[in-house]
């Protein structure tokens, strides 16, 4: 058993049929010595008396808010949560496996630039009685500071019969140099509590590996005289690291109709303009990627050909 | 600790081309190592990230773009003195700071060159003959060093009398390649910045 926060404790249980469970001793936070009784949750049934209560925690029915009273007055609470371990593996029931970029990916993180700011998000089908708390650091043995905000519900989607909820959090490394060469990864730890179930999820990454620029901005077309070719120009996104001559991007320019199966014109360039062939009912799209370290491409910025 | 804006004339920067070749060569070599050594811990997640130039050179700090010198987190640099002549300095107006930066890059390359050559000598003794260093990568390191044209003492190639542990050598190769790729990215960014300035 360990303390998650004040008056909230996590009991780690090997979860299998007829498991013996864990013996837990609760102590009432009071100078009083006698006349103390214990109850669980909203029940008025007295579970025991005395300053300490010893319980055998085997299942979710044994978890919850234990309260010690004296003469009708509440003295203190202890909330017990369960953390299940099945076949040596901690449960991951609360969050959905996003399976990208690999299986068992519960947390996904992205950074728009090298400033040390990044966003992580996760998915769940659970809508109520759900709380998250996020901690982060650079390295684990001698951790350097990363400050994370509160996790918030950022999107709701319908997936078949189920609703899916996306939560996200923004974090900022306390003293980040955009030009630094990372040797210690960022660690992100998410504590998830659903009702009386506790789970924790972690992710470890270098900022350089989670870079995904914003799409290029200010796309403009200029038809070339006596030609079917069009000059398309754009600018670096405002959120990208500066100076741009140091933090350079490379671009992919594509002309395609509405369907992905349609034929297309595609060209890669390090410049902020390119010449492509425009077709009726097609769109010109441009996306960006770090020129020197190939992490993710940005989303597409698009303009219609006509 | 920073690069000034007044640097060589546009298009007069012979090192840019060589640095692009360097990044390409080390990326290809790393990809080859990952494929060939698929049953070894050779991915970014699996290896320890070591920097053989740590406390010996200060490339990131010495080559910091002027715009980032206002960022206090970028300024915890180690002061190191370097030789200040080089043929990539295509303008006489080039400052002492830029010479410091380019000479730091030269020292990086020299250190990695020695490590890679020592390692290759060991890998050539491996009866499995599983992986060797790409001669192209070694040549590209040499070309960039020549373009930088700094005079410095030759670092002797390390020779070892004991029987090499090939498993450890291959893991060390992965660690070195990952670190060198990261440094090659920095070098490419620096050369691009200098070329544009």
């Amino acid at each position: 058993i360990w303390e998650l926060k004040k008056d909230v404790y996590v009991v780690e249980l090997d979860w299998y049929p007829d498991a013996p469970g864990e013996m837990v001793v609760l102590t009432c936070d009071t100078p009083e010595e006698d006349g103390i009784t214990w109850t669980l949750d909203q029940s008025s049934e007295v579970l025991g008396s005395g300053k300490t209560l010893t319980i055998q925690v085997k299942e979710f029915g044994d978890a919850g808010q234990y309260t010690c009273h004296k003469g009708g007055e509440v003295l203190s609470h202890s909330l017990l949560l369960l953390h299940k371990k099945e076949d040596g593996i901690w449960s991951t029931d609360i969050l959905k496996d996003q399976k990208e970029p690999k299986n068992k990916t519960f947390l996904r993180c992205e950074a728009k630039n090298y400033s040390g700011r990044f966003t992580c998000w996760w998915l769940t089908t659970i809508s109520t009685d759900l709380t998250f708390s996020v901690k982060s650091s650079r390295g684990s043995s001698d951790p350097q500071g990363v400050t994370c905000g509160a996790a918030t519900l950022s999107a709701e989607r319908v997936r078949g019969d189920n609703k899916e909820y996306e939560y996200s959090v923004e974090c900022q490394e306390d003293s980040a140099c955009p030009a630094a060469e990372e040797s210690l990864p960022i660690e992100v730890m998410v504590d998830a509590v659903h009702k009386l179930k506790y789970e924790n999820y972690t992710s470890s990454f270098f900022i350089r590996d989670i870079i995904k620029p914003d799409p290029p901005k200010n796309l403009q077309l200029k038809p070339l005289k006596n030609s079917r070719q069009v000059e398309v120009s754009w600018e670096y996104p405002d959120t990208w690291s500066t100076p741009h001559s140091y933090f350079s991007l490379t671009f992919c320019v594509q002309v395609q109709g509405k369907s992905k199966r349609e034929k297309k014109d595609r060209v890669f360039t390090d410049k902020t303009s390119a010449t492509v062939i425009c077709r009726k009912n097609a769109s010109i799209s441009v996306r960006a990627q770090d020129r020197y370290y190939s992490s993710s491409w940005s989303e597409w910025a698009s303009v219609p050909c006509s | 600790r920073n690069l000034p804006v007044a640097t060589p004339d546009p298009g007069m920067f012979p090192c840019l081309h060589h640095s692009q070749n360097l990044l390409r060569a080390v990326s290809n070599m790393l990809q080859k190592a990952r494929q060939t050594l698929e049953f070894y811990p050779c991915t970014s997640e699996e290896i320890d990230h070591e920097d053989i130039t740590k406390d010996k050179t200060s490339t990131v700090e010495a080559c910091l773009p002027l715009e980032l010198t206002k960022n206090e987190s970028c300024l915890n640099s180690r002061e190191t003195s370097f030789i200040t002549n080089g043929s990539c300095l295509a303008s006489r107006k080039t400052s002492f700071m830029m010479a410091l930066c380019l000479s730091s890059i030269y020292e990086d390359l020299k250190m990695y060159q020695v490590e890679f050559k020592t390692m290759n000598a060991k890998l050539l003794m491996d009866p499995k003959r599983q992986i060797f260093l790409d001669q192209n990568m070694l040549a590209v390191i040499d070309e960039l060093m020549q373009a930088l044209n700094f005079n410095s003492e030759t670092v002797p190639q390390k020779s070892s009398l004991e029987e090499p542990d090939f498993y450890k050598t291959k893991i060390k190769l992965c660690i070195l390649l990952h670190a060198f790729r990261i440094r090659a990215v920095t070098i490419d960014r620096v050369m691009s910045y200098l070329n544009a300035s």
């Epitope: 079917r228 199966r261 034929k263 297309k264 014109d265 595609r266 890669f268 062939i277 009726k280 | -």
Partner: antibody, heavy 118, light 107 residues
Framework: QVQLVQSGAEVKKPGASVKVSCKAS????????LHWVRQAPGQGLEWMGW????????EYAPKFQGRVTMTTDTSTSTAYMELRSLRSDDTAVYYC???????????WGQGTMVTVSS | EIVMTQSPATLSVSPGERATLSCRAS??????LHWYQQKPGQAPRLLIY???QSISGIPARFFGSGSGTEFTLTISSLQSEDFAVYYC?????????FGGGTKVEIK
């Protein structure tokens, strides 16, 4: 699968014209760009131009501008390349090729040998 | 127009050995570079597109790399069926242009 079958070999006199055909099967002609590339005996490859069968748009290499015409007949799934004012150095194998991407060549025809000789 | 230069013109290699073919562009073409293989009496066949992207059905021993002005096609271990002429082609701008080819022959 996608296939391109070209017309047979031709022998032409200098100053004449030649029209090479290229019949597509295994796909809808309008779904792909169509290019023509030639190869003189023992020489390398030379791009001549492309046509978009969907709308008839064409782009020719400057070297062939004014001397080449590329057309398609969607009813027969056939593309044509006509080269006029033939010279002896136009002797080559002419290939048609198709791709969903405009700028490189995925599916090639078997080639048509055109000999220009007096 | 962009001029593509391939080297060497002829490469003599023993089966099982590694072959490295070079292609240089007269100006920067990013990764807009494609490789083809042509055997005598046959049409060319696409091997690699956009400098390093593999084509399904093409053996993994064919490996493309490079960007800007310098590109390489590496055949890690030459098989008898790999002896052929290899062409690079740029798609950065029209007119599309090919290199002069590298003939890979048996040593």
């Amino acid at each position: 699968q996608v296939q391109l079958v070209q017309s047979g070999a031709e022998v032409k006199k200098p100053g004449a014209s030649v029209k090479v055909s290229c019949k597509a099967s295994g796909y809808t002609l309008t779904d792909y760009y169509l290019h023509w590339v030639r190869q003189a005996p023992g020489q390398g490859l030379e791009w001549m131009g492309w046509i978009d069968p969907e709308n008839g748009d064409t782009e020719y290499a400057p070297k062939f501008q004014g001397r080449v015409t590329m057309t398609t007949d969607t009813s027969t799934s056939t593309a044509y390349m006509e080269l006029r004012s033939l010279r002896s150095d136009d002797t080559a194998v002419y290939y048609c090729n198709a791709n969903k991407e405009l700028r490189y060549f995925d599916v090639w025809g078997q080639g048509t040998m055109v000999t220009v000789s007096s | 127009e962009i001029v593509m230069t391939q080297s060497p013109a002829t490469l003599s290699v023993s089966p099982g050995e590694r072959a490295t073919l070079s292609c240089r562009a007269s100006q920067s073409i990013s990764i807009n570079l494609h490789w083809y293989q042509q055997k005598p009496g046959q049409a060319p066949r696409l091997l690699i597109y956009f400098a390093s992207q593999s084509i399904s059905g093409i053996p993994a021993r064919f490996f493309g790399s490079g960007s800007g002005t310098e590109f390489t096609l590496t055949i890690s271990s030459l098989q008898s069926e790999d002896f052929a002429v290899y062409y690079c082609q740029q798609s950065n701008s029209f007119p599309l242009t090919f290199g002069g080819g590298t003939k890979v022959e048996i040593k």
